[in-house]
Interface confidence: low
């Protein structure tokens, strides 16, 4: 029942152009090129996209025309390899062009940079943005796609089209408003925050597929879709999982036209079959395509069917457990995961996957034993500690969050993680710990039944950021170990890390703790980041410092910044008071 089996097309590029329409075709090709060649100027990408689009139109007119039968990878790869400055801009990435498909595309994929050396996006004045929007709306929106795509090379392309649509709507509405800034800025903030979250979530999906394989992704999808659609039958969930896996494999592999096309087909299928999938889809299915796909992806869990029988009957008490397992291992484990997940919307997906892994390990051992039933009879008892561990961790951390508030909770995590993995770069520790700390405001407000899926699945996304950033420049064996051994045990692995006793403290450098008057003009967020950067450096210098000592130094530091920002001669204050603060802190910490 796969929705994606299509007749063979003479010209793949013509087929996708016709399916997607010119506007979406051009947008997706721009995203694809910007995600591959992240340093190229905007104008160069627009030129390449226009050339590809003109070529696609000739193929639509005549599918038998020259080169129209070539694969999209061949067409796009050839186009990327015409960039004159490839060698000087991208170095060894230029070697990809000497390869044949499919190796050439794999080579481009391997050179995607999760942390490209690009300037921070600075938001111009509202009037400047509105003028640019009115002067050339098309260029303005293309530039948005380009800037996001090059900074987020794994951003889910069809979802980026949805963001661009909202971006356009915000400018269309707000540039006519009486108070443009009051209308526009909150919308742009919301899009920025949602965009970062969307990028990080998709990055985990791609890491799951690329580092742990299709089976790992499918297991994740079975668990999540079974929670979301508990009334759907196993066969229906399996079909959705197969189709969803194809969509994400394509997007993560740079096949953005196929991905967007297949995602639209999947949304169409879900809406045509909502009666057998979920009662919550009605509103989503009334929306236009981009909104519809987004809405389905975010739809709330359907109500669990009443009177679901005990799981034990089929998976523990039955005499046929080993027979069923032996006949089709992955199908049987998939059914176990489906049945467990649909009964437990209160569990995180990663916990459900740990339970399934424990069940699998037990069956592997017990089905070879003299008395299999006796051997696996108590398997559900092994789940108890696995369930309690995240429950307790979330309870403790939400209590700490409520006690401290977000900023101080982030600081506690900064200290905790710097002590665990002090070799990791300071910007990465700050970024990751700040995001870990956001779990408090995101999830602790929820009732018990929603806390774990919110918190632990969010932490999986954030820890994946650490893993992909660390992979670029590996500095810690402990990080590598936690990131590569097991996808579902990453969070418990990091939680279990103690202070790294092998770490040799960093030499003290007064320059690291020298601050200037420019800190006074920073936004509250930027000021926090400055202070948190200093805190990480402090822990790297003095990893054995107590909480009390660190708190005292940070409180003194906050007071120093506040005092100097109120001073008439700010720069002199920062210079003189800063020296005193550093000396006092050194004395207090024994540096």
């Amino acid at each position: 029942r796969g929705v994606f089996r299509r007749d063979a097309h003479k010209s793949e590029v013509a087929h996708r152009f016709k399916d997607l329409g010119e506007e979406n075709f051009k947008a997706l090709v721009l995203i694809a090129f910007a995600q591959y060649l992240q340093q190229c100027p905007f104008e160069d990408h627009v030129k390449l996209v226009n050339e590809v689009t003109e070529f696609a139109k000739t193929c639509v007119a005549d599918e038998s025309a020259e080169n129209c039968d070539k694969s999209l990878h061949t067409l796009f790869g050839d186009k990327l390899c015409t960039v004159a400055t490839l060698r000087e801009t991208y170095g060894e990435m230029a070697d990809c062009c000497a390869k044949q498909e499919p190796e050439r595309n794999e080579c481009f994929l391997q050179h995607k940079d999760d942390n490209p050396n690009l300037p921070r996006l600075v938001r111009p004045e509202v009037d400047v943005m509105c003028t640019a929007f009115h002067d050339n709306e098309e260029t303005f929106l293309k530039k948005y796609l380009y800037e996001i795509a090059r900074r987020h090379p794994y951003f889910y392309a069809p979802e980026l089209l949805f963001f661009a649509k909202r971006y356009k709507a915000a400018f269309t509405e707000c540039c006519q408003a009486a108070d443009k800034a009051a209308c526009l800025l909150p919308k742009l903030d919301e899009l920025r925050d949602e965009g970062k979250a969307s990028s990080a979530k998709q990055r985990l999906k791609c890491a799951s597929l690329q580092k742990f394989g299709e089976r790992a992704f499918k297991a994740w999808a079975v668990a999540r879709l079974s929670q979301r659609f508990p009334k759907a039958e196993f066969a229906e969930v399996s079909k959705l999982v197969t189709d969803l896996t194809k969509v994400h494999t394509e997007c993560c592999h740079g096949d953005l036209l196929e991905c967007a096309d297949d995602r639209a087909d999947l949304a169409k299928y879900i809406c045509e079959n909502q009666d057998s999938i979920s009662s919550k889809l009605k509103e989503c299915c009334e929306k236009p395509l981009l909104e519809k796909s987004h809405c389905i992806a975010e739809v709330e869990n359907d109500e669990m069917p009443a009177d679901l029988p005990s799981l034990a009957a089929d998976f523990v008490e039955s005499k046929d457990v080993c027979k069923n397992y032996a006949e089709a291992k992955d199908v049987f484990l998939g059914m176990f995961l489906y049945e467990y997940a649909r009964r437990h919307p209160d569990y995180s997906v990663v916990l459900l996957l740990r339970l399934a892994k424990t069940y699998e390990t037990t069956l592997e051992k017990c089905c070879a034993a003299a008395d299999p039933h006796e051997c696996y009879a108590k398997v559900f008892d092994e789940f108890k500690p696995l369930v309690e561990e995240p429950q307790n961790l979330i309870k403790q951390n939400c209590e700490l969050f409520e006690q401290l508030g977000e900023y101080k909770f982030q600081n506690a995590l900064l200290v905790r993680y710097t002590k665990k993995v002090p070799q990791v770069s300071t910007p990465t520790l700050v970024e990751v710990s700040r995001n870990l700390g956001k779990v408090g405001s995101k999830c602790c407000k929820h009732p018990e039944a929603k806390r774990m899926p919110c918190a632990e699945d969010y932490l999986s996304v954030v820890l994946n950021q650490l893993c992909v950033l660390h992979e670029k420049t590996p500095v810690s064996d402990r990080v590598t170990k936690c990131c590569t051994e097991s996808l579902v045990n990453r969070r418990p692995c990091f939680s279990a890390l103690e202070v790294d006793e092998t770490y040799v403290p960093k030499e003290f450098n007064a320059e690291t703790f020298t601050f200037h008057a420019d800190i006074c003009t920073l936004s509250e967020k930027e000021r926090q980041i400055k202070k948190q950067t200093a805190l990480v450096e402090l822990v790297k210098h003095k990893p054995k410092a107590t909480k009390e000592q660190l708190k005292a130094v940070m409180d003194d530091f906050a007071a120093f910044v506040e005092k100097c920002c109120k001073a008439d001669d700010k720069e002199t204050c920062f210079a003189e008071e800063g020296k005193k603060l550093v000396a006092a802190s050194q004395a207090a910490l024994g540096l």
Partner: nanobody
Framework: DVQLVESGGGLVQPGQSLRLSCAAT????????MAWFRQFPGKEREFVAA??????GYVADSMRGRFTISRDTKDTMILRLSSLKREDTAIYYC?????????????????WGHGTQVTVSE
């Protein structure tokens, strides 16, 4: 929007107790921290006590031991005043934040009740 309604104020003698209650109505209120402030004539509002969404209570140092804060339900907050003194005479205001954590500054609270008068007198 959110409405806060205080009740339980009144006239008591020194040394006696009172139970002030604050009920939140309007949109779903489960994520909010709530607090009590009091105001003496011609003075700024003074922080009394606060409680987080998760039920973590905090009472101002000068009142700790005599006043206790709790949540009856997620949208009802109770302040118990015992061993009342004449200087506790004031208007007591209920306040709520848009976030789940507590704060002691009045400016951090988005929603306010109209207040309930507590008078301690012979």
């Amino acid at each position: 929007d959110v409405q806060l309604v205080e009740s339980g104020g009144g006239l008591v003698q020194p040394g006696q107790s009172l139970r002030l209650s604050c009920a939140a109505t309007g949109r779903s209120f489960t994520t909010n921290a709530m607090a009590w402030f009091r105001q003496f004539p011609g003075k700024e509002r003074e922080f009394v006590a606060a409680i987080s969404w998760g039920g973590l209570g905090y009472v101002a140092d000068s009142m700790r031991g005599r006043f206790t804060i709790s949540r009856d339900t997620k949208d009802t907050m109770i302040l118990r005043l015992s061993s009342l003194k004449r200087e506790d005479t004031a208007i007591y205001y209920c306040a709520a934040r848009k976030t789940s954590t507590t704060a002691t500054e009045a400016t951090m609270y988005a929603y306010w009740g109209h207040g309930t008068q507590v008078t301690v007198s012979e």
